[in-house]
């Protein structure tokens, strides 16, 4: 019968010939009367056999990631008779792994959107690296993820590549962040190879800004001949949020005379001061009213940023018109 152990050859061996093992018949008494032959893919080019001893050698550098095993056939012939001593047998040479591949992030570029002011622990995105080395061979393909850039706002789970928020972020201070993640094989031990990827994290807006008047005092004038419904001027508040979070409503907070009204121009987000009742210079030549501004809609959890509505004082001077 045939006698051999399992055959392994390390990949990327630089020697011109590397002894893999021996293949022999148990009828071989060592007097060089038998001839061993190798057949199959790789025989003669990648692997050779010593015809007398049955020793097998790799004569080419191998790459496990290209081909991880070779199936060959062995023959043994009695030189004197030319007959087969054993039936032809199939055997396997396995290419064993070395850590010659760095982790690669295949889904680049990564981009994620997360709401500003999200609490610590909020999941942002998961990044995944692949390592072409053999996952069953030691730690060659066991990866650990770490953060190279992005502290203190982000953290990455070492074994999963899940990126989470580690500190609240405010879109109005910075609206996007570049995070750099490194994946290291060999679970970070000496000899590890690494790859990096960048993640663009954009903050989406939440309603964490209340509108605030540009001026604390406005001066307007109205002619005593102005009919009711006349627009006598505009007031303006700032809201640094965007989109619907910046939509605002103006209203009168104080107007003892009940002479004026304020409507909101939702296109320009300005407040328009309107004459509600006709004015008479001889009766009253100036008015003081207070206007306030609020966001259209504020979710309950964001009310702490909207505790008191901004107000402004409007001084309105009535212009005299000569009366017949």
């Amino acid at each position: 019968g045939w006698v051999w152990n399992q055959f392994f050859v390390p990949e990327e061996m630089n020697t011109t010939s590397h002894h893999i093992g021996q293949l022999r018949s148990d009828l071989d008494n060592g007097n060089n009367s038998f001839q061993y032959k190798l057949l199959g893919a790789g025989a003669g080019s990648t692997f050779i056999i010593d015809e007398r001893t049955g020793d097998i050698y790799a004569i080419q550098k191998l790459d496990r990631e290209e081909r991880s095993l070779y199936i060959l056939r062995a023959q043994v012939i009695d030189i004197a008779t030319g007959r087969a001593v054993e039936p032809e047998s199939e055997f396997v040479i396995k290419v064993s792994d070395i850590n010659d591949n760095e982790p690669k992030f295949l889904d680049e570029p990564y981009e994620a959107i997360v709401p500003e002011m999200s609490p610590e622990g909020t999941l942002v995105i998961q990044v995944t690296a692949s390592d072409a080395d053999d996952p069953s061979s030691g730690n060659n393909a066991r990866l650990l993820y770490s953060l190279l850039q992005g502290q203190p706002y982000f953290s990455v789970e070492p074994t999963t590549g899940v990126i989470r928020i580690s500190s609240k972020m405010d879109r109005e201070l910075q609206d996007e962040y570049w995070v750099i993640i490194q994946a290291k094989d060999m679970i970070g031990q000496p000899g590890a190879l690494s790859g990096t990827t960048s993640v663009l994290i954009k903050l989406s807006d939440v309603n964490d800004n209340k509108p605030i008047f540009k001026e604390s005092l406005y001066r307007l004038t109205v002619s005593e001949s102005a009919p009711t419904g006349t627009s006598i001027g505009t007031i303006m508040a700032y809201d640094n949020d965007i989109g619907e979070n910046a939509e605002m409503d103006y209203s009168i907070e104080e107007d003892d005379s009940q002479t004026f009204d304020i409507i909101t121009n939702h296109e320009t987000q300005e407040g328009i001061v309107i004459l509600k009742k006709k004015v008479d210079f001889e009766h009253q030549n100036h008015y003081g009213i207070r206007a306030k501004v609020k966001n259209h809609h504020v979710p309950e959890q964001l009310m702490k940023y909207h505790t008191e509505a901004s107000t402004t004082f409007i001084k309105i001077q009535v212009e005299d018109v000569d009366e017949p």
């Epitope: 879109r171 109005e172 201070l173 605030i212 540009k214 604390s216 700032y238 940023y305 505790t307 008191e308």
Partner: antibody, heavy 125, light 106 residues
Framework: QVQLVESGGGVVQPGRSLRLSCAAS????????IHWVRQAPGKGLEWVAV????????YYADSVKGRFTISRDNSKNTLYLQMNSLRAEDSAVYYC??????????????????WGQGTTVTVSS | SYELTQPPSVSVSPGQTASITCSGD??????VSWYQQKPGQSPILVIY???KWPSGIPERFSGSNSGNTATLTISGTQAMDEADYYC?????????FGGGTKLTVL
Amino acid sequence: QVQLVESGGGVVQPGRSLRLSCAASGFTFSRYGIHWVRQAPGKGLEWVAVIWYDGSNKYYADSVKGRFTISRDNSKNTLYLQMNSLRAEDSAVYYCARRAGIPGTTGYYYGMDVWGQGTTVTVSS
Amino acid sequence: SYELTQPPSVSVSPGQTASITCSGDRLGEKYVSWYQQKPGQSPILVIYQDNKWPSGIPERFSGSNSGNTATLTISGTQAMDEADYYCQAWDSSTVVFGGGTKLTVL
């Protein structure tokens, strides 16, 4: 790292002029408004002036209006304060400070998040 | 012009809670920032927009703002918190600082 460094301070006689500079590094200078704030010896902070990120708007404290001019050169990452007609009460440590907030935001709700180490101006005869 | 008023000094024992107030007309309608300044050093922003923390500031510092008064609260006060504290607000395109409060940790 993010840094602001003031220079140009010194001793000057009343009525004379002085120009302060503030060199920025470690951040995109052209995206931020910058303030000048001063502090007289043993006194509190007093706001002096602000310039928007693109130089389009400038505002001044009443105490310096008409005498001081704030300007910036974004190509040189530098802020300036030209101080004319100096008075004894202008003696102080002058700080430049970055206005927190991205371009497009307005107002000064987010504070001043980066400050220089200050440069001392002494107005004395 | 708009004015912000702070008490000149506040004292607190280590581990206790310190409260520093800042008052101004209808201040609750505005947003307030707070700065810490130690002797010979530049100011540091510790609270902005009434109650938000800049990166790196411990949550022992907190802020509130209502009516005519904003308050900076330091819980579990430490010796290293001894400093001058300034409130700051914005009014009609100008910036206003309070006069400052010296916090002494006894």
